[in-house]
Structures are given as C-alpha cells and as structure tokens.
C-alpha cells in the first residue's frame, strides 16, 4: 500500500482544515497555553517498524477523531469545517486499517507497541482533562487546536516508519 504518499497528503489536508478552524485570536489566549507533554522524545528515540508506525499513527488519529466528535467540540467549531476535518481523519483511519490488513503476517513486538499506544492515550487524556478543567472555553479549544496541529507535525519518526520495508 502506498501509505507514505496518501498519509502525507491527507495529513496536509487535515492540517489546513485545522488551521482554518480557528475562531478567535490565539493571541488572546496566551495565558491559557499548557504543556501537554506529547511523547515526542519516546518516538524520536525509537526506530519504528512499518506495522508499529501504522498502529501508533492509527491511535493518534483515532484519539483526535474522538476528541473532535464530542458535543462540546461541535459547539466550539464551525460545523462544515469540523465535518470536513472529521471526514479527512476518518479516511486516514480507513487507509491505515487497509494497510494493516496488507501487512498481516509481519512480525511485531506487541508489548513495545502497547507502550507507545499507552503514551498516546495518556497524552490525549491530559488534553481532555485540560478542556474539562477549563470548562471547554473558547481559549481552551484554541490551545488544544494548536497542540493537535503540533502533534500532527511532530510525528515525523512515525512517518519514517511508514516508508520502511518490514
């Protein structure tokens, strides 16, 4: 499956949509910024095999999809942009799932992968907790939007893993 190409294209589209979704000036939200501790160092220090990269990226996109599919999210963003963004994420999930099926039979280290997936889940838990604590304020959503854009850009090592032949 030609995942690096399609994922890169969809990722760019998702980023552009996310960029367009901004509703308020982020400069009015400087005091609300928060460190969510994206597990960048864990990812950077690891050479991902293709199946590992797929499953961790799938988890990241799934968690992002869940985050932006809530009622609170629907109230925060312009509906048509949110729908386009969700559709883009859904397509990415489908692409990744199709690739997993093609990659069956490839050896994997499940325990190591579980650690990365757990790190991603904890990261999104921190984001959800922050939104709850901030009562889903417009500034809280703006901070989260910037964080998700950054996490999409951060996962370069995962994308390198997609190009690898297992």
């Amino acid at each position: 499956c030609d995942l690096p190409q399609t994922h890169s294209l969809r990722n760019r589209r998702a980023l552009i949509l996310l960029a367009q979704m901004g509703r308020i000036s982020p400069f009015s939200c400087l005091k609300d910024r928060h460190e969510f501790r994206f597990p960048e160092e864990e990812f950077d220090g690891h050479q991902f095999q293709k199946t590992q990269a797929i499953s961790v990226l799938h988890e990241m996109i799934q968690q992002t999809f869940n985050l932006f599919s809530t009622e609170d999210s629907s109230a925060a963003w312009e509906q048509s942009l949110l729908e386009k963004f969700s559709t883009e994420l859904y397509q990415q999930l489908n692409d990744l799932e199709a690739c997993v099926i093609q990659e069956v039979g490839v050896e994997e280290t499940p325990l190591m992968n579980e650690d990365f997936i757990l790190a991603v889940r904890k990261y999104f838990q921190r984001i959800t907790l922050y939104l709850m604590e901030k009562k889903y304020s417009p500034c809280a959503w703006e901070v989260v939007r910037a964080e998700i854009m950054r996490s999409f850009s951060f996962s370069t090592n995962l994308k390198k893993g997609l190009r690898r032949k297992d």
Partner: antibody, heavy 120, light 111 residues
Framework: QVQLQESGTVLARPGASVKMSCKAS????????MHWVKQRPGQGLEWIGV????????TYNQKFKDKAKLTAVTSANTAYMELSSLTNEDSAVYFC?????????????WGQGTTVTVSS | DIVLTQSPASLAVSLGQRATISCRAS??????????MHWYQQKPGQTPKLLIY???NLESGVPARFSGSGSGTDFTLNIHPVEEEDAATYYC?????????FGSGTKLEIK
C-alpha cells in the same frame, strides 16, 4: 525549501509612506502566521506585529499600531507591510519572519530584510 | 511590556572554552510547564537564526554545543566548546505575553 523574499532597499522622504513585500515559497502560506521585526543600524530587534494570511487576522505591538499596517494576498503568497508618516526613527531593516511551532510564537525562517532609509 | 535584560553586553571567550549569556525578564514568561523564551544568533550582515526555543529545546540542525536553560525570569544560553564560527550577536526573545520583545543582544568575540 522555505524561502521569504523581501523587496529591495527603499529611500523615502519624511512624512511619506512605504509599502514593502515578502514573498513566501516552499510551504503553505495560508496556514502560518507571519511576523514583522524591525532592526535599527547597530541596534537590537523589535517585534512589530503578526498577520495570519489565511484570514487576514492581525495583532500589533501597540507601539507600532499607528505606524504599520500588515496585509497579505494569498493568491500571490505575499505579505505586505506599509509604514506611514515616516520619520528618521523609521530608518531600519525590516524582516518578515515565519511563525514556528504554532503557539510557541518563535521565528524559524527570516527574509533577507528590506532596508528603509528616511532622508530629506 | 516585559523587558529582557541581557548580560554581558559583550564577551570574549577563548576557542574551546565556555560562553555563558544571561537573559533576565522583568516578569515571568513561564506558564503551565513551558517557558516562552527563545534564543537567536545573528552574524554580521546576516539574518537572525533560531537556536533554542522554549528555553531549552535545540532547534533542528543546531550543533549540540548550544544549550539553553532557565525558567520564570532567569534564562541562560551556554556555548561549549566555543568555535570560531560562533562569533555573533545573540538575542533572547520572549513570547509570554504581548508584545513579544527581544533582549538588547550580547556580542560574542572569539579570542
């Protein structure tokens, strides 16, 4: 690769206005904030303001809000800064710079600078 | 406005030694785990170059001899071991609140 190409040297009279340009290439122009920074000869750096080309949103340093006007034309991938009511204090090099890492608000790529000289 | 005071204004360091540049903010630029302080290098006739962001994160492609530390109001840029090509002016910049401001610069000379 990312490039920011600024317009050339400008010589202007006191009281006049000048408009300088910054043409971006190598990245998605509409999805990155663009900062403008001033540097007087032999001196430090001053942040003027920032524009989001995607929707034209601007935020200014209050010190420059009556001096500088930031605009962008997305079809040309170009950001502009207009300086009005020029005085000798406005003689400086002006840089356009791309915002980096979203809300960290640091600057990764810089244009080569436009030199403005105000003289009668 | 937050004032950033850099010291020293200039320093001369021998090749291979350590250069330490300080930047003090008139108000804290740290919130919730991040310190919004960044460092740039500007060589004569060139544009500034980002070295360090968020107080201690090394920008991609910047040599590991550059390091940043600090939080709240006190920040430091260290260069060790200093090389000839490090002769430049170094600026700190904060993005803690509006307006963003820069320090007045520290000129590093290599002996």
């Amino acid at each position: 690769q990312v490039q920011l190409q600024e317009s050339g040297t400008v010589l202007a009279r006191p009281g006049a206005s000048v408009k300088m340009s910054c043409k971006a290439s190598g990245y998605s122009f509409t999805t990155y904030w663009m900062h403008w920074v001033k540097q007087r000869p032999g001196q430090g750096l001053e942040w003027i303001g920032v524009i989001y080309p995607g929707n034209g949103d601007t935020t200014y340093n209050q010190k420059f809000k009556d001096k500088a006007k930031l605009t962008a034309v997305t079809s040309a991938n170009t950001a502009y800064m207009e300086l009005s009511s020029l005085t000798n204090e406005d003689s400086a090099v002006y840089f356009c710079t791309r915002n980096y890492k979203y809300d960290y608000y640091t600057m990764d790529y810089w244009g080569q600078g436009t030199t403005v000289t105000v003289s009668s | 406005d937050i004032v950033l005071t850099q010291s020293p204004a200039s320093l001369a360091v021998s090749l291979g030694q350590r250069a330490t540049i300080s930047c003090r903010a008139s108000k804290s630029v740290s919130t919730s785990g991040h310190s919004y302080m960044h460092w740039y290098q500007q060589k004569p006739g060139q544009t500034p170059k980002l070295l360090i962001y968020l107080a201690s994160n090394l920008e991609s492609g910047v040599p590991a001899r550059f390091s940043g530390s600090g939080s709240g109001t006190d920040f430091t840029l260290n260069i060790h071991p200093v090389e000839e090509e490090d002769a430049a002016t170094y600026y700190c910049q904060h993005s803690g609140e509006l307006p963003f401001t820069f320090g007045s610069g520290t000129k590093l000379e290599i002996k």
